[in-house]
């Protein structure tokens, strides 16, 4: 059951797993929340009648009934993990804490000219989990304007206190807006021989990678395949850090792997989701439950509804058993990870999906795109929708994108003489125009909210946001697409496709069926050369073949230029201008999201 | 001590080419981030390319995109700056710069080390 309500002045009694500090009882259920085992929690708020040291505590706790006794004390604020709870999830905190020194591991000073200043600073230093800034106000003069980067084990405050005149934030790595450099390579026959600060079993390295990406102090690790010849390590994964960031020795070694945290292109891989099935694999763990199942897939379902499982083993039914049932084991661990992974014993493992939702939802895996024709099938393009307009007689606008459950990017033309929200309509999940009957349900529009820098298409600016009135629910032919993040602003991009009902030629009419077309990217500088007349910005990304013949056209304007990149679709580019449609050596001129990330998520998160 | 020397700079024509050398001691380029950042007449500094040899991640400001290519040489311990297409716009004094962290590849301030510079100037 999810509970998301906070209980005032309410105790939870025992099920203590370990106590952290945090700024505030929201920021305690997210941490409660990511850890493995933590279903309940009780913070302790600063209150004259509580114990100083005791404010800004942190009390993770478990409990096999899922709850744990209540008892009245005033100050203590308790709660329920969002484990529970179906709506996705964010570690993202862009919270600031004033008048609050959060103690850590102090590894850097500065001078810095705000606190916004110094937040980025810690977002973009590979160590910093969290900051303090002493203000302009702040007593001592000599630590005026200082920034504080701090580092934690565990990625939290070691200690919080009352301090005037300063503040405190955590890094936003987790909000996808550092600047670090993302480095997606996993190198095989690679040992780093750097410290080890944690291990744990994992049964791939791409696994390995996830966990070490959502460990606080992890930057880099080794995997040791099932073929290490020593036989105790392996499926180890070592979780490494140094104080350079960096791996400072590479050992050439035959089945071990390694690579890097993805913590600073956090938001468009699966970094929580472990889907994949281990077959002839055994996880080893505490044992929950054991239950009868048809299939791994049952049993893989029936461990992401158990709030407590985090892994399981199936071992299928021996011959006509068990009305053909096998045998489910649900697990759980410490850390999340099963404790000794065995192969050759017949059994099929896995996760629980429970953690997906800790994942942006852009990121689970979508319908195989059909290759070769110019019509879509249903669920091939899951974000895309199609923008109505009423007034004076429906018709279809425009296309835009799905990138959160209340959220449609378009393309700030669109609304040329649109004078109210009323008058918009949105549909997703349509494949074919001629669906869309007088009651087919739609999204209605609460808000349009256009870059203040817009004036027209071909200067830039071309992007705006549709907040809907209520909201997506997420399924195979409605869901969102990844931005894509500032990590990774240096990716080439090499499968991108355009999509929408627009016109096929110059002088046509809007398609049934939805388009798509494949088109490489071109560079700035050569999308330049092709408009002369026109300032071709790094606002601005350009696609399309020399010889012309495939393009976006009227119709398609606001819809997504998708590029597919590391098995994940981003939203890089908004369709918004060109000469004709089509034309030979005349790329369309799309929207560069990339570099609106900051501006989208400053409008979409603000409350 | 570190020393990064740049060298291959001068003058050309607007769609002309340059190769940038960038020779190390005491310093080296393997399994670092080391780039290339430039300052124009009047103006701040700016990134230009970057690259981490571990698995060869390259980073480009979109200015250059599609015309500069970084690489490196291990064995030499030098780092190059291949610049085809240049624009007017290009000239600037080029510096080769080395990083002991992991960087916003293309933030001059998290690099520590840093040459002296090569000037470049493209006439139209």
């Known amino acids: 059951e999810c509970v998301t309500q906070l209980l005032k002045d309410t105790c939870f009694e025992g099920g203590d797993i370990t106590t952290v500090f945090t700024p505030s009882a929201k920021y305690c259920q997210v941490v409660c929340t990511y850890h493995p085992r933590c279903l309940l929690f009780t913070f302790t708020a600063e209150s004259p009648s509580e114990d100083p040291t005791r404010w800004f505590t942190c009390v993770l706790k478990d409990s096999v009934t899922e709850t744990l006794p209540r008892v009245n004390r005033t100050a203590a604020i308790s709660g329920y993990s969002f484990k529970q709870c179906s709506h996705q999830i964010s570690a993202c905190n862009k919270d600031i804490y004033v008048d609050l020194d959060m103690k850590g591991i102090n590894y850097n000073s500065s001078v810095a000219k705000s606190a916004q200043e110094c937040q980025e600073r810690c977002t973009d230093d590979v160590h910093c989990h969290f900051f303090t800034y002493a203000t302009r106000q702040f007593p001592s003069l000599e630590h005026r304007n200082i920034c504080l980067l701090k580092h934690t084990q565990t990625g939290t405050p070691t200690r919080i206190t009352k301090l005037d005149k300063v503040v405190s934030g955590f890094s936003l790595k987790s909000c996808a807006l550092s600047n670090l450099a993302c480095i997606r390579d996993i190198f095989p026959n690679t040992v780093f021989a750097d410290s080890n600060i944690d291990s744990v079993m994992a049964p791939d390295a791409f696994v390995c990678g996830r966990i070490c990406t959502h460990h606080p102090g992890c930057l880099f690790f080794t995997f040791f395949s099932q073929e290490w010849p020593k036989e105790s390590q392996r499926n180890l994964c070592l979780l490494k850090t140094s104080e350079s960031g960096l791996p400072s020795t590479r050992i050439k070694k035959s089945k071990a792997l390694s690579g890097f945290s993805l913590q600073s292109c956090r938001h468009s891989i699966p970094v929580f989701c472990h889907s994949s099935f281990y077959h002839d694999t055994d996880f080893l763990g505490e044992e929950l439950d054991i239950v009868a199942a048809k299939s791994h897939e049952a049993c893989q379902k029936l461990c992401t509804n158990a709030v407590r499982c985090q892994f399981f083993t199936y071992t299928p039914a021996q011959a006509s058993c068990n009305e053909g049932k096998g045998k489910c084991y649900l697990k759980l661990s410490s850390n999340g990870s099963p404790t000794k992974i065995l192969h050759g014993r017949g059994g099929i493992s896995g996760y629980t999906l429970r953690l997906c939702k800790m994942d942006n939802e852009c990121t689970t895996k979508i319908k195989p795109r059909i290759v070769g024709g110019t019509a879509s099938v249903r669920g091939e393009w899951p974000w895309q929708v199609t923008l109505h307009t009423t007034s004076p007689t429906q018709r279809h606008l425009c296309g835009g994108s799905i990138i959160g459950n209340q959220w449609i990017l378009t393309a700030a033309h669109c609304f040329y003489g649109v004078e109210s929200p009323k008058i918009l309509r949105v549909y997703s999940g349509i494949l074919n125009q001629s669906e869309i009957k007088e009651d087919t349900s739609f999204f209605g529009v609460q808000e349009i909210i256009i870059h203040d820098q817009y004036k027209m298409a071909e200067s830039g600016y071309d992007i705006a946001l549709l907040k809907l009135e209520t909201t997506v629910n997420y399924t195979d032919s409605q869901r969102p697409i990844c931005l894509p993040s500032k990590g990774d602003r240096n990716v080439i991009y090499t499968d991108c496709w355009v999509t929408g009902w627009g016109y096929r030629k110059l002088r046509d009419k809007i398609q049934n069926t939805l388009q798509k077309a494949k088109i490489p990217l071109v560079t700035n500088e050569e999308c330049q050369k092709r408009y002369r007349g026109h300032k071709i910005t790094h606002k601005m990304i350009c696609a399309g073949y020399r010889e012309g013949g495939k393009d976006a056209c009227k119709g398609d304007s606001g819809g997504p230029l998708s590029c597919k990149h590391n098995e994940v679709w981003h939203l890089v580019g908004i369709t918004s201008w060109g000469e004709g449609c089509a034309q030979r050596e005349r790329p369309g001129v799309y929207t560069n999201v990339v570099e609106y990330v900051d501006w989208i998520l400053e409008k979409t998160q603000a409350v | 001590q570190v020393q990064l020397v740049e060298s291959g700079g001068g003058s050309v024509q607007a769609g002309g080419s340059l190769r940038l050398s960038c020779a190390a001691s005491?310093?080296?380029?393997?399994?670092?981030?080391v780039g290339w950042f430039r300052q124009a007449p009047g103006k701040g500094l700016e990134g230009v390319s970057a690259?981490?040899?571990?698995?060869?991640?390259?980073y480009y400001a979109d200015s250059v995109k599609g015309r500069f290519t970084i690489s490196q040489d291990n064995s030499k311990n030098t780092l190059y700056l291949q610049m085809n297409s240049l624009k007017p716009e290009d000239t600037a004094v080029y510096y080769c710069a080395g990083a002991i962290t992991w960087v916003p590849p293309l933030s001059h301030r998290r690099y520590t080390y840093w040459g002296q510079g090569t000037l470049v100037t493209v006439s139209s």
């Open positions: 690259i981490y040899s571990l698995g060869g991640s390259t």
């Open positions: 005491g310093y080296t380029f393997n399994n670092n981030f």
